[in-house]
């Protein structure tokens, strides 16, 4: 058993049918010695008396808020949560496996630049009685500071019969140098509590590996005289690291017909302009990627040919 | 990429082209190592990230763009001094710091070159003959060093008398390639920045 926060405790259980469970001793936080009784949750049934209460925790029915009283007055509370270990592996019931970029990916993180700011998100089908708490650091043995905000519900989607909820959190490394070469990964730890179930999820990454630039901005077309060709121009996104000559991007320019089946013409360039043939009803899209370290491409910025 | 690429002008800066070749070569070598050594811990998540140039050179600090010198977090240690001649210095306006920067890059390359050559000698003794260093990568390191053209003491190639542990050597190769790729990215960024200046 360990303390998650004041008066909230996590009991780790080897989870299998007929498991013996864990013996837990609760102590009433009071100078009083006599006339103390214990109850669980809203029940008035007295579970025991005395300053300590010994319980065998086996299932969720044994978890909950234990309260010690004296003469109708509440003295203190202890909330017991359960953390299930199923065949040597901690349970992952609360969050959905996003399966990207690989199986057992519960937390996904992205950074728009090298400033040390990043966003993580996760999915669940649970709508109520759900709380998250996020901590982060650079490295684990001698951790350096990363400050995370509160996790918030950022999107709701309908997937088949189920509703899916997306939560996200923003974090910022306390002293980040955009040009630094990372040798210790960022660690992100999410505590999830659903009713009386506790779970924790972790992700470890280098900022350089989670970079996904914003799409190029100010995408414009300039027709070339007496030609079907157009000059496409764009700019670096505002959120990208500066100076741009050091943090350079490379770009992919795509001409796509109205039908998804039509052949796509693609050109790669390090410049912020390109000359392409603009077909009728087609659209021109441009996306960006770090020129020197191949992490994710940005989303497309698009403009119609007409 | 096997698609059409609009190549940038090499510009006035003779080292830019070499640094781009270096990054391409080390990235290809790392990819080859990850595929060939699939049963070894060779991915970024599995290896220890060691920097053989740590405390010996200070490339990131010495080569910091002027715009980032206002960032306190980027100014840890900038007191390492280096030799200050070199043929990549195309303009007389190039600052003393730029000379330090290019000299630091040269020292990095020299250190990695020695490590890679020592390692290759060990890998050639492996009866499995599983992986060797790409000669193209070694050649590209050499070309960039020549373009930088710094006079520096030659570091003797390390020779080892004991029987090599090939498993450890291959893991060390992965560690070295990961670190060198990260340094090659920094070198490319620096060359691009200098070319634009």
């Amino acid at each position: 058993i360990w303390e998650l926060k004041k008066d909230v405790y996590v009991v780790e259980l080897d989870w299998y049918p007929d498991a013996p469970g864990e013996m837990v001793v609760l102590t009433c936080d009071t100078p009083e010695e006599d006339g103390i009784t214990w109850t669980l949750d809203q029940s008035s049934e007295v579970l025991g008396s005395g300053k300590t209460l010994t319980i065998q925790v086996k299932e969720f029915g044994d978890a909950g808020q234990y309260t010690c009283h004296k003469g109708g007055e509440v003295l203190s509370h202890s909330l017991l949560l359960l953390h299930k270990k199923e065949d040597g592996i901690w349970s992952t019931d609360i969050l959905k496996d996003q399966k990207e970029p690989k199986n057992k990916t519960f937390l996904r993180c992205e950074a728009k630049n090298y400033s040390g700011r990043f966003t993580c998100w996760w999915l669940t089908t649970i709508s109520t009685d759900l709380t998250f708490s996020v901590k982060s650091s650079r490295g684990s043995s001698d951790p350096q500071g990363v400050t995370c905000g509160a996790a918030t519900l950022s999107a709701e989607r309908v997937r088949g019969d189920n509703k899916e909820y997306e939560y996200s959190v923003e974090c910022q490394e306390d002293s980040a140098c955009p040009a630094a070469e990372e040798s210790l990964p960022i660690e992100v730890m999410v505590d999830a509590v659903h009713k009386l179930k506790y779970e924790n999820y972790t992700s470890s990454f280098f900022i350089r590996d989670i970079i996904k630039p914003d799409p190029p901005k100010n995408l414009q077309l300039k027709p070339l005289k007496n030609s079907r060709q157009v000059e496409v121009s764009w700019e670096y996104p505002d959120t990208w690291s500066t100076p741009h000559s050091y943090f350079s991007l490379t770009f992919c320019v795509q001409v796509q017909g109205k039908s998804k089946r039509e052949k796509k013409d693609r050109v790669f360039t390090d410049k912020t302009s390109a000359t392409v043939i603009c077909r009728k009803n087609a659209s021109i899209s441009v996306r960006a990627q770090d020129r020197y370290y191949s992490s994710s491409w940005s989303e497309w910025a698009s403009v119609p040919c007409s | 990429r096997n698609l059409p690429v609009a190549t940038p002008d090499p510009g006035m800066f003779p080292c830019l082209h070499h640094s781009q070749n270096l990054l391409r070569a080390v990235s290809n070598m790392l990819q080859k190592a990850r595929q060939t050594l699939e049963f070894y811990p060779c991915t970024s998540e599995e290896i220890d990230h060691e920097d053989i140039t740590k405390d010996k050179t200070s490339t990131v600090e010495a080569c910091l763009p002027l715009e980032l010198t206002k960032n306190e977090s980027c100014l840890n240690s900038r007191e390492t001094s280096f030799i200050t001649n070199g043929s990549c210095l195309a303009s007389r306006k190039t600052s003393f710091m730029m000379a330090l920067c290019l000299s630091s890059i040269y020292e990095d390359l020299k250190m990695y070159q020695v490590e890679f050559k020592t390692m290759n000698a060990k890998l050639l003794m492996d009866p499995k003959r599983q992986i060797f260093l790409d000669q193209n990568m070694l050649a590209v390191i050499d070309e960039l060093m020549q373009a930088l053209n710094f006079n520096s003491e030659t570091v003797p190639q390390k020779s080892s008398l004991e029987e090599p542990d090939f498993y450890k050597t291959k893991i060390k190769l992965c560690i070295l390639l990961h670190a060198f790729r990260i340094r090659a990215v920094t070198i490319d960024r620096v060359m691009s920045y200098l070319n634009a200046s």
Epitope: Y16, F60, K85, D87, G88, D93, K102 | -
Partner: antibody, heavy 115, light 111 residues
């Protein structure tokens, strides 16, 4: 006392269907994940499928994906394996089993796919 | 499709020490616990070892398990005639959990 009692095995022609059942008692069935494991005659153990305690997630071996469906009825304390488009290579003893460090196995039920 | 490799058979005389190896990889045994089962002819498998080296109550202490890196082993010290059976190791793979990964199985013969 944890008990898993299996039923539903038998002889079936290729291409036909069969449903296996596994009735659980002696524990809170709705709290635990469950597996199906099979063993072809003279061969080793092969995992077939898994279902979470609440039925929310199901996982299958590639060899049965799209043909077999694992399900559970927590109100009846019963686990099921619906097998469709059966093939000769599905011939095996099928076992249900609880998920956890200490596990309990059903007695096994023989499924023979033969024309 | 077995990822965990065991020797097809091992044998020993009564009282001898018999060991069975189970070889896996970094993504399975390398990062997950190992179980061992004993299967007597015509019966369901019986758990002998869980958590690499833990014995459930009722399993004789002549059975012991261990794990090192990407391999595990089961030792029977002082093998007895009733130990003649098939033995299977089992673990999980990081990418496919909760799918059970079983070893190829080892037939133990007591001479």
């Amino acid at each position: 006392q944890v008990q898993l009692v299996q039923s539903g095995g038998g002889v079936v022609q290729p291409g036909r269907s069969l449903r296996l059942s596994c009735a659980a008692s002696g524990f809170t069935f709705s709290s635990y994940g469950m597996h199906w494991v099979r063993q072809a005659p003279g061969k080793g153990l092969e995992w077939v499928a898994f279902i979470r305690y609440d039925g929310s997630n199901k996982y299958y071996a590639d060899s049965v994906k799209g043909r077999f469906t694992i399900s559970r009825d927590n109100s009846k304390n019963t686990l099921y394996l619906q097998m469709k488009s059966l093939r000769a290579e599905d011939t095996a003893v099928y076992y249900c089993k609880t998920h956890g460090s200490h596990d309990n196995w059903g007695q096994g039920t023989m499924v023979t796919v033969s024309s | 499709s077995y990822v965990l490799t065991q020797p097809p058979s091992v044998s020993g005389t009564p009282g001898q020490r018999v060991t069975i190896s189970c070889s896996g990889g970094r993504s399975n045994i390398g990062r997950n616990t190992v179980k061992w089962y004993q299967q007597l002819p015509g019966t369901a498998p019986k758990l002998l070892i869980y958590g690499n080296d833990q014995r459930p109550s009722g399993v004789p202490d002549r059975f012991s398990g261990s794990k090192s890196g990407t391999s595990a082993s089961l030792a029977i010290t002082g093998v007895q005639a009733e130990d003649e059976a098939d033995y299977y190791c089992q673990s999980y793979d990081r990418g496919t959990h909760p799918a059970l990964l079983f070893g190829t199985g080892t037939k133990v013969t007591v001479l």
